[in-house]
Interface confidence: medium
Amino acid sequence: VPLSRTVRCTCISISNQPVNPRSLEKLEIIPASQFCPRVEIIATMKKKGEKRCLNPESKAIKNLLKAVSKERSKRSP
């Protein structure tokens, strides 16, 4: 019998609001796992050190991820 695991997603609530890449301190993508069945995207904002949870399905967030990865690839040698 498999051990029952507590579902431990980090995010309390998820935002669909667009995020200005300039206000971002850091962006973390946590893949789905045995502890949390969904992908979690955590954006650390420069103001307040606030950690926002972004909706991976939102068009605005998908665009943000594209912009951030584009910016990263520009910076990498």
């Epitope: 431990r8 980090t10 995010c11 309390i12 609530s13 998820i14 935002s15 850091k26 973390e28 946590i30 979690e40 955590i42 650390t44 307040k48 050190g49 606030e50 950690k51 926002r52 949870c53």
Partner: antibody
Framework: QVTLRESGPALVKPTQTLTLTCTFS??????????VIWIRQPPGKALEWLAR???????HYNTSLKTRLAISKDTSKNQVVLTMTNMDPVDTGTYYC??????????????WGQGTTVTVSS | QSVLTQPPSASGTPGQRVTISCSGS????????VNWYQRLPGAAPQLLIY???QRPSGIPDRFSGSKSGTSGSLVISGLQSEDEADYYC???????????FGGGTKLTVL
């Protein structure tokens, strides 16, 4: 079930350094988006936030107390330690640790410890 | 002196509706959300309301929150004897760049 428990000396002499430990269970500070914060309440006064540490070891301090505070974590022991130097009788009060989770705003503490009372007196 | 102002005490009889106010300014409640905490006698504080009007799971719907301008309100409808506790509001202050709290309201159920 998430629990947090504060421990430390009940009595501290003026000018001494206070060391408080928050031992928690039910979550891990290795998980992205988790944070632990220290808050205090002097008798008859409002709650006041002191310091916060994030899973990525980012540290935030109350500006007015920044020079006296240091926060650290030991993820293997599930503990967060707060040190406060140069203690004064006005630092007497109940000290709490609490948990912050991503997605709820930077001042939403969804689980708290019972608090530990610290008296500063010679 | 607290940054957020709450009445020191409030009271009501079982079944009544009680409102606790939390007054701030444009730099805190005016531009940020309000949260409410309950501290029962001898217990750890607990989150009652976050983001102005959101209830965490497990909090009865007798508790509700709202925000208007630079003030927040906590409403307890159908007051019960176990609601006797201290209630605190909290927000973020852009000028102080930190979390701020109200002085607390002691609620007595008569």
């Amino acid at each position: 079930q998430v629990t947090l428990r504060e421990s430390g000396p009940a009595l501290v002499k003026p000018t001494q350094t206070l060391t408080l430990t928050c031992t928690f269970s039910g979550f891990s500070l290795t998980t992205s988006g988790m944070s632990v914060i220290w808050i205090r309440q002097p008798p008859g006064k409002a709650l006041e936030w002191l310091a916060r540490i994030d899973s990525d070891d980012e540290k935030h301090y109350n500006t007015s107390l920044k020079t006296r505070l240091a926060i650290s974590k030991d993820t293997s022991k599930n503990q967060v330690v707060l040190t406060m130097t140069n203690m004064d009788p006005v630092d007497t009060g109940t000290y709490y640790c609490a948990r912050l989770r991503a997605g709820s705003g930077p001042y939403v503490f969804d689980s708290w410890g019972q608090g530990t009372t610290v008296t500063v007196s010679s | 002196q607290s940054v957020l102002t709450q009445p020191p005490s409030a009271s009501g009889t079982p079944g009544q509706r009680v409102t606790i106010s939390c007054s701030g300014s444009s730099s805190n409640i005016g531009s940020n959300t309000v949260n409410w905490y309950q501290r029962l006698p001898g217990a750890a504080p607990q989150l009652l309301i976050y983001n102005n009007d959101q209830r965490p799971s497990g909090i009865p719907d007798r508790f509700s929150g709202s925000k208007s301008g630079t003030s927040g309100s906590l409403v307890i409808s159908g007051l019960q004897s176990e609601d006797e506790a201290d209630y605190y509001c909290a927000s973020w202050d852009d000028s102080l760049n930190g979390r701020v709290f109200g002085g607390g309201t002691k609620l007595t159920v008569l």
